[in-house]
Every structure is written in structure tokens, then in C-alpha cells.
């Protein structure tokens, strides 16, 4: 509900500063509060615009302050207006000169329809002039000068709503600025009645509260609260939940409080008089000191709160036994809550006696919407109301109010909610690399839409066209490898960002699709690589019989060991060999092969081969003759790689014999590096030569080696290989 309060300080203007303060207590108006002159009540008042300023001591309050030199321009009627959700509330008040000839008994007077009413003005200045009375600026009555009484009265024996208005009194020679004002408020209904047709019964509005004729609710005087205004506020506080405070040294002294009709204006509890600067006499309390204490057990009467009941007693006169009521208090509610947009379950926790029920706890949104608890529980000391907002959004940011209203009183606690936008990546993740069972992803988590800071990141993935839930992995780096994927499967990927707080998971970002490779076919079997010429190598393999219908081909990769030269060749799948040409003579090549369909197959092991040589081979090196016996010896050697050496020839003869009497031993396996000569003669000197042969021809030995066999009985000997020049 809207709680609008207008403080008129002071209604009787002298040469002191005077002001009007309009307070929106416990709610946030949709439009600014306005303070203006009430021309409906008084047409011919001053036309000067008002200087309305923000009241710096309160969040939602406006103020007009008149300095003492402006006193002559102040007389008249004023209003304050506040609006929320299309509903407008207007509060009216007046200001008049303290030096006026007459002064009203009260600033406002609220009566019920049909009441017998006397509107009275006290004569403070005696003049030999007729007295005149106006209603809303129009003349209604005059009193001849010799008949002007001390108390000038307008009598309405049977008040009707149309009698309501601003009544003013002055001498005929005076003007607006010497007039006294009082406002009559006539409730549309008779006493204790409310409703459009005035045939519903009001609840009791205690402590001079007034029953609103349209809603049946009580409008409580400043200093009292609750559904029936039974509960006194803490000292010097006012408002529907008593959370506004009078900052003066003597509390609410000199503050005239004006509330929405039909309440009108009154002093705060404990004060009386037109200026609200007179304390109540002993035994009296309440607004304008109109309430009399009749404390049952002789309890003390407090002019602000009434009877101060002894422990175990309660009620206005301490007439009821029971645990004293305790004003509800809202606990454990932080001043500021950061909330992620989406579902929100605010909690309002309150103490008090009796404990608040779920009907008595509400939550008011910044736009004035009143929420009721979705869930409720209570312990011995606290009531806990849980509210549900299914979708809270950034526009819901602002001041929310937890409100508790029990028979023991009312309390409201505003708190600020800041609704954050959940983060969402602007870009889809990028696929850097894929295999048949893995993918390397750049998650592209920035830039993102929404609010940070980002607490964590998730990469979500799932096969397309599968009714599987999204799987996810927590990600810390921008580059991540997804493993254990299915081969030849289309996946979709997206990134979800998580910000701090409950429900911080943002909506997943844009989706990227990719397909894993098929599991590759095995490499060709029986691979063999042989030189064909100085510039060609021949690669052969066994025929391939694929298990699927898919087209396939053999990919052959060859690269030179000596040079950075690489070539990939595609060979139709029905072939079993490929000639690798345009090679360099006497060069070593590494070759591997795989069988590809749409997916790439597995590479074979590397095969190496040399192209045939374009020069004669070098002589074998490190020639040694060892293990010499009377009839045998072992010859060993090494050859250089890369000269297409196909065979080694060992030529030996008895020294001194003719050339044509030599024996040639041809070793056709060039990988063999030693040979045992057998059937030699004992104690005989042999001349031994060794040649390497390749496609060009034989190597040229620089010298021959000598071998002398042992006598028949001697142990074997090693010969370092004495050299004999040829």
C-alpha cells in the first residue's frame, strides 16, 4: 500500500522559516512526488511557482522551504501527490498567518456523514468589522460586527459529503492573508460504515485511526500502526510501519502530519495545538492528545504510547491477560542482494509476538506489486516466508521491501536487489583439429553478453540427431581437447558461462557443428620398396580387399632423407605397386603408405631405400683378416651406404702364382660384412683383394692384403692385414 505523508511545519506562519515535506515511506513512486498549490480549495491564492527540492535526509521525499522574508506569500492551500501503478494519492494542507484575526480550532476536521458538526474559529483580534466566512474561496456567511463572538462557528446539523471543503474566516476588511483556514473532511459514509454503498461495517480503528470509506482499512495516526492502529510506535517514529523518524530535539514537536483523506491532519502522538508544540496533559495521549488513558491496573500513562502495561497484560487499557505483544522485527535480511536473472526465492524472516503468520508477511517489488509467500514455516522464535519469483529480470532491480503486519504492529525493511544478466558467449567455439575420437576446441568464451565476473566455463557437447543429454566438461583454458568421441559422428558444441551466485549458469552460446573422422583402414600389407633405377624406386604391396563399399585409394608419401623434399602420391585402390620417379641418384628416401576412404587410414611403418648410384662404389673399408689357421681365415669389412652396392667379391691367390690362377668368391648379399676362406694350404702366403660392385661397376682396390696360413699344429693367429701395393 502507498504510504504518503505530508509534514506541515508550521501551519501558522510568523516570521520564522516554514516548510512542507512530502514523504513516500516504504515504497518507490513510479513518478516523482509533486507538491503544489491547491487551487481547487482556494482559487485566489498566490500564483508564484513553488521551489520543490529533494529532502536530502530521506530517499523518497520532496520539500518546499520558505525563508522568513517570504512570509507574506505563503498563505493558502497546498497538496502533495504520489502515484504508483496508476493509483494516485493526494494529501492536502493549509498555511496561514499567525497574526490572522481568527484561528481555527483544528487544521482539519474529519466527520462521518450525518454528523452534527460545528466548525469553529477563535477570535484573536478584535475589530469593529463584520466577520465573513468562505468555503473554498466563495462567500457563504457573515456576522454583523457587533455580534462577532469569541468563537465563530459554522453549524452543520447533518453533515453531507458536499459540505466538505476549506472554510476560511476573516474580517470583511481583510483579505486572504489575514484569513484563517480549516478543512472539513466528511466521510462518504455514516459512522462505522464503508463500501461503495456504505453498508459494510468498519473494523475498529483504535487510537483515533479513521476507517477508509472505500476500502474499510484503518488509516492510522502518526505514532500508531497495525491493521487496527492498536500498536504504538517506538518513540518519535511514524509511518505505516513506524520506520520514519522525527529528527527534532524534542521528537515530533512542531510537526503537523497530514495523511490521505479521510484522515486529514493531526499532531503526532504526544502533542497538541495548531502548531503541535504543546505536550499532552497528564492522563492524555495520542494525536492531538485526544485519547484518555484508563489503565486498568494503575499502570503508568505515557503521552506517546498510552498505558504501559505490566508484564503479563496487554490491550489499550491493559485489560487482557497474556504475553505482551512484541512488534515484529525483520532479521537476517542483507541491505544489498545480487541476484542472477531467472528464478529467485527471496526469504523474509521475522520475530515478534504473536509470531507473524504467512498472511501477515509480504514482499513489495519496486513497482509496487505485492507478493505473498509461496512457502512458510516457523520455529519458536521466527517466522520464515519464502517467496517465488519465477523470472526476475534486470528491470526488477531496485528497492524491494519485506513487510510484516501483525496485531502487534507493522515493520518494513527495504533492501536493494541488483539483478544481473547471465553471461552468454557471443561466438561459437572453433574446432582446431579433429580425429576419429578426439577434437581440439578453442572455446571462444570472450567476448560475452551479460554480466561477469565469470566463475567457471563449461564446454557442452553431444552428437547431433541423438536424443542424448548434453555432456559437459569444466574448462579452465581456452584450448581444450575432447576425447573419447565416436568416429564418423556429427557433434554439436557450445559454451556455457557461469557467474557467481545461485543460478549463475548462463544460457549456452552459439552452437558449432563438426564431424569426427572415420576410424582409418589398416596400412597395405606386404609393403616392399626397391630401387628400380638411378631416379626411380618401386613400392609394391599385397592386393587390398576393403570391408566396406566405400571407394578407397592408396596414399604414398615419400621424402628424401638428405633434402627437404616430400611428395604424396594417390594410387588407385585396385593397383598393387607404384613407381616413384623423378628422384635423385644415390639418394636415400623414406616411404610410407596408407589406405584412405573418406576417412584417412593408418600410416604404415617407414620403409627406406636408395636410388641406384650414378658412380662406381667406393672400396670396402676397415678390412681385417683374423682367425687364421693352417687352412682358413676370416675376412671382415665395412661398406658405405648409398652406393647401391649389390655384391662383394673376395679374390685370392697364392703369392707368386699367375693372375689367372686366382679364386673369386662373390657375396651377393651386400649386408654380409665377413667371410671365412677355407681350404687354404698350410704355411702358405696368399694375396687377398676385396671389391664392391654396384649398377655402374666394381670398386678399384688401392692395394692387396697378405694372408699367411699357419703350420698344421699351431693355434689361430690374427693378422693386422699387411699391405702390398699393386
Amino acid at each position: 500500500a502507498m504510504d504518503l505523508i505530508l509534514i506541515n511545519s508550521l501551519p501558522l506562519v510568523s516570521d520564522a522559516e516554514t516548510s512542507l515535506t512530502c514523504i513516500a515511506s516504504g515504497w518507490r513512486p513510479h513518478e516523482p512526488i509533486t507538491i503544489g498549490r491547491d487551487f481547487e480549495a482556494l482559487m485566489n491564492q498566490h500564483q508564484d511557482p513553488l521551489e520543490v527540492t529533494q529532502d536530502v535526509t530521506r530517499e523518497w521525499a520532496k520539500k518546499v522551504v520558505w525563508k522568513r522574508e517570504k512570509a507574506s506569500k505563503i498563505n493558502g492551500a497546498y497538496f502533495c501527490e504520489g502515484r504508483v501503478r496508476g493509483e494516485a494519492i493526494r494529501i492536502r494542507t493549509m498555511k496561514m498567518r499567525q497574526q490572522a484575526s481568527f484561528l481555527p480550532a483544528t487544521l482539519t476536521m474529519t466527520v462521518d456523514k450525518g454528523d452534527n458538526v460545528n466548525i469553529s474559529f477563535k477570535k484573536v483580534l478584535i475589530k469593529e468589522e463584520d466577520a465573513v466566512i468562505y468555503k473554498n474561496g466563495s462567500f457563504i456567511h457573515s456576522v454583523p460586527r457587533h455580534e462577532v463572538p469569541d468563537i465563530l462557528e459554522v453549524h452543520l446539523p447533518h453533515a453531507q459529503p458536499q459540505d466538505a471543503g476549506v472554510y476560511s474566516a476573516r474580517y470583511i476588511g481583510g483579505n486572504l492573508f489575514t484569513s484563517a483556514f480549516t478543512r472539513l473532511i466528511v466521510r462518504r459514509c455514516e459512522a462505522q460504515k464503508w463500501g461503495p454503498e456504505c453498508n459494510h461495517l468498519c473494523t475498529a480503528c483504535m487510537n483515533n485511526g479513521v476507517c477508509h470509506e472505500d476500502t474499510g482499512e484503518c488509516i492510522c495516526p502518526p505514532g500508531f500502526m497495525g491493521r487496527t492502529c492498536e500498536k504504538a510506535c517506538e518513540l518519535h517514529t511514524f509511518g505505516r510501519t513506524c520506520k520514519e523518524r522525527c529528527s527534532g530535539q524534542e521528537g515530533c514537536k512542531s510537526y503537523v502530519f497530514c495523511l490521505p483523506d479521510p484522515y486529514g491532519c493531526s499532531c503526532a502522538t504526544g502533542w497538541k495545538g495548531l502548531q503541535c508544540n504543546e505536550a499532552c496533559h497528564p492522563g492524555f495521549y495520542g494525536p492531538d492528545c485526544k485519547l484518555r488513558c484508563s489503565c486498568n491496573n494503575g499502570e503508568m500513562c505515557d503521552r506517546f504510547q498510552g498505558c504501559l502495561c505490566s508484564p503479563g497484560w496487554q490491550g489499550l487499557q491493559c485489560e487482557r491477560e497474556g504475553i505482551p505483544r512484541m512488534t515484529p522485527k525483520i532479521v537476517d535480511l542483507p541491505d544489498h542482494i545480487e541476484v542472477n536473472s531467472g528464478k529467485f526465492n527471496p526469504i523474509c524472516k521475522a520475530s515478534g509476538w504473536p509470531l507473524p503468520t504467512n498472511e501477515e508477511m509480504t514482499l513489495v517489488k519496486p513497482d509496487g506489486t505485492v507478493l505473498h509467500p509461496k512457502d512458510f514455516n516457523h520455529t519458536d522464535h521466527f517466522s520464515v516466508a519464502i517467496f517465488t519469483i519465477h523470472r526476475i529480470l534486470p528491470p526488477d532491480s531496485g528497492v524491494w521491501v519485506c513487510s510484516v503486519n501483525t496485531v502487534a504492529g507493522m515493520v518494513e525493511k527495504p533492501f536493494n536487489i541488483s539483478v544481473k544478466v547471465l553471461p552468454k558467449p557471443l561466438n561459437a567455439p572453433n574446432v582446431i583439429d579433429t580425429g576419429h575420437n578426439f577434437a581440439v576446441i578453442n572455446i571462444s568464451s570472450e567476448p560475452y553478453f551479460g554480466d561477469g565476473p565469470i566463475k567457471s566455463k563449461k564446454l557442452l557437447y553431444k552428437p547431433v540427431n541423438h536424443y542424448e543429454a548434453w555432456q559437459h566438461i569444466q574448462v579452465t583454458n581456452e584450448i581444450v581437447t575432447l576425447n573419447y568421441l565416436e568416429p564418423r559422428t556429427e557433434y554439436e558444441l557450445c559454451v556455457q558461462l557461469v557467474r557467481r551466485g545461485e543460478g549463475g549458469e548462463g544460457h549456452p552460446g552459439p552452437v558449432r557443428r563438426f564431424t569426427t573422422a572415420s576410424i582409418g583402414l589398416p596400412p597395405p600389407r606386404g609393403l616392399n620398396l626397391l630401387p628400380k633405377s638411378q631416379t626411380t624406386l618401386n613400392l609394391t604391396w599385397q592386393p587390398i580387399f576393403p570391408s566396406s563399399e566405400d571407394d578407397f585409394y592408396v596414399e604414398v608419401e615419400r621424402r628424401s632423407v638428405q633434402k627437404s623434399d616430400q611428395q604424396n602420391i594417390k594410387v588407385p585402390g585396385n593397383l598393387t605397386s607404384v613407381l616413384l620417379n623423378n628422384l635423385h641418384p644415390r639418394e636415400q628416401y623414406v616411404v610410407r603408405a596408407r589406405v584412405n576412404t573418406k576417412a584417412q587410414g593408418e600410416w604404415s611403418e617407414d620403409l627406406t631405400a636408395w636410388t641406384l648410384s650414378d658412380i662406381l662404389p667406393p672400396q670396402p673399408e676397415n678390412i681385417k683378416i683374423s682367425n687364421i689357421t693352417h687352412s682358413s681365415a676370416v675376412i671382415s669389412w665395412t661398406i658405405l651406404d648409398g652406393y647401391s652396392i649389390s655384391s662383394i667379391t673376395i679374390r685370392y691367390k697364392v703369392q707368386g702364382k699367375n693372375e689367372d690362377q686366382h679364386v673369386d668368391v662373390k657375396i651377393k648379399n651386400a649386408t654380409i660384412t665377413q667371410y671365412q676362406l677355407k681350404g687354404l694350404e698350410p704355411e702358405t702366403a696368399y694375396q687377398v683383394d676385396i671389391f664392391a660392385e654396384n649398377n655402374i661397376g666394381s670398386s678399384n682396390p688401392a692395394f692387396s692384403h697378405e694372408l699367411v696360413t699357419l703350420p698344421e699344429s699351431q693355434a689361430p693367429a690374427d693378422l693386422g692385414g699387411g699391405k702390398m701395393l699393386l
Epitope: 463500501g195 461503495p196 459494510h200 461495517l201 475498529a204 472505500d214 487496527t228 492498536e230 498472511e359 496485531v407
Partner: antibody
Framework: QVQLVQSGGGVVQPGRSLRLSCAAS????????MHWVRQAPGKGLEWVAV????????YYADSVKGRFTISRDNSKNMLQLQMNRLRSEDTAVYYC??????????WGQGTVITVSS | DIQMTQSPDSLAVSLGERATINCKSS????????????LAWYQQKPGQPPNLLMY???TRESGVPDRFSGSGSGTDFTLTISSLQAEDVAVYYC?????????FGQGTRLEIK
């Protein structure tokens, strides 16, 4: 917790009288107007009577006017409905209730009255 | 007296579906001065007293789930349950409090289809 506990129901012959009571707790009973509403078996709700918080004002449905009397004892937090010259059409579940504005917010558990010969 | 007429008399709706109950008053219950409709809705389960759901035609009472909503103005009003739950099976009544005596509709029985 606000509670309204009803008593006094039963079976009664046509033309006889019966008194229903409603005891209130958890609220300042003396501050609230109180209503009686009834519901005939298998039928809808029918408002019967209302009394102001101080007992000064009382209103009745035409169907019970002159036969039923609503009263209250604020010192005992008690509401009563004195039903005289009962008729068979008065057979119903009777509820006491507290208003929230013009809606009825808190209801008693109900008490069954059967008027039968 | 203002007459209140509800329609339909009974209604069967599947769980999770929307249920709509109408209420018509013989004269307007909208008060132009404050633009409020003086209409309330109640739910009554077997063997229990009625439970206030809505007042001022569209203001939800404390503790009432937000699947219940009230709308309408003047003479035509609607109570809507956006997604019917098993516990919503009951009789629903509208009531005007524009004028005394307060009067109720004849009730609408809501069941699960």
C-alpha cells in the same frame, strides 16, 4: 495464529432454538466485525448475519431476519448466533468468519445444524 | 441484492492444463472513485471451510500459489488456474462485497479429466 473455534451444533426439531458459539484467538477480537455464513447440504454459500466490532450494529439476511440474533462478548472473545423458530431449510453447516475488507479471510471449522422432526 | 452467476456449474480439466471459471454480477461491482472491483474468489475442498483466494478481483491472498489469477471488471470476472494441479480439485465461489448483503455465486465444481 488466528483461530476461530466453533461449537453448539446438533440436531433440533423444527420450531425449536439453538445457540452457536465461535471463540476467537490470536487477534484483537474486539476490533473486528464478525460474520455468520451457512451452507446447506450440497449447496452454495449463503451469508447470514454480521455484527460490528462493538456490537452496536447488526444486519441479517432476509431469510433469517426476526428469528436469528447475532451477538458478541468482547471480554470473552466470543461470537454467538441465537437461532429461534428453526425451519428445515435452516439445515446447513454454519461458519463464523472475520472480514478482510469485504472478503472473508479467517473462517471457523464449521458446525453442522440439522433441523428435522 | 446483487445476484452472482457462475459458469460452468462443473468443469473437468486435465492435469497441467488451464482452467477458467467465469462469474457474472447482476450489476457492476466496479467503484469508479477508486477503480476497484469489489469481488472475491474462494476455494472450498470437501469437509473444509472456504479459503480466500482473491480479493479486489485480482489481488492474490497471502499463501495462494501464483498459478491462480483473477481478472475482469464491472460485471464479468474470471478466475484462471494456469496449470491445474491435483490439489486444485474443489468447488470455487465468487462473492461480491460492493453492496450488503454480500452474495456468493452458486459455485463451480472443478475436477480432473
Amino acid at each position: 495464529q488466528v483461530q476461530l473455534v466453533q461449537s453448539g451444533g446438533g440436531v433440533v426439531q423444527p420450531g425449536r432454538s439453538l445457540r452457536l458459539s465461535c471463540a476467537a484467538s490470536g487477534l484483537t477480537f474486539a476490533n473486528y466485525a464478525m460474520h455468520w455464513v451457512r451452507q446447506a447440504p450440497g449447496k452454495g454459500l449463503e451469508w447470514v448475519a454480521v455484527i460490528s466490532y462493538d456490537g452496536e450494529n447488526k444486519y441479517y439476511a432476509d431469510s433469517v431476519k426476526g428469528r436469528f440474533t447475532i451477538s458478541r462478548d468482547n471480554s470473552k472473545n466470543m461470537l454467538q448466533l441465537q437461532m429461534n423458530r428453526l425451519r428445515s431449510e435452516d439445515t446447513a453447516v454454519y461458519y463464523c468468519a472475520t472480514p478482510k475488507g469485504g472478503a472473508l479471510e479467517i473462517w471457523g471449522q464449521g458446525t453442522v445444524i440439522t433441523v428435522s422432526s | 441484492d446483487i445476484q452472482m452467476t457462475q459458469s460452468p456449474d462443473s468443469l473437468a480439466v486435465s492435469l497441467g492444463e488451464r482452467a477458467t471459471i467465469n462469474c457474472k454480477s447482476s450489476q457492476s461491482v466496479l467503484y469508479s472513485s477508486n477503480n476497484k472491483n469489489y469481488l472475491a474468489w474462494y476455494q472450498q475442498k470437501p469437509g473444509q471451510p472456504p479459503n480466500l483466494l482473491m480479493y479486489w478481483a485480482s489481488t492474490r491472498e497471502s499463501g495462494v500459489p501464483d498459478r491462480f489469477s483473477g481478472s475482469g471488471s464491472g460485471t464479468d470476472f474470471t478466475l484462471t488456474i494456469s496449470s491445474l494441479q491435483a490439489e486444485d480439485v474443489a468447488v470455487y465461489y465468487c462473492q461480491q462485497y460492493y453492496s450488503a448483503p454480500i452474495t456468493f455465486g452458486q459455485g463451480t465444481r472443478l475436477e480432473i479429466k
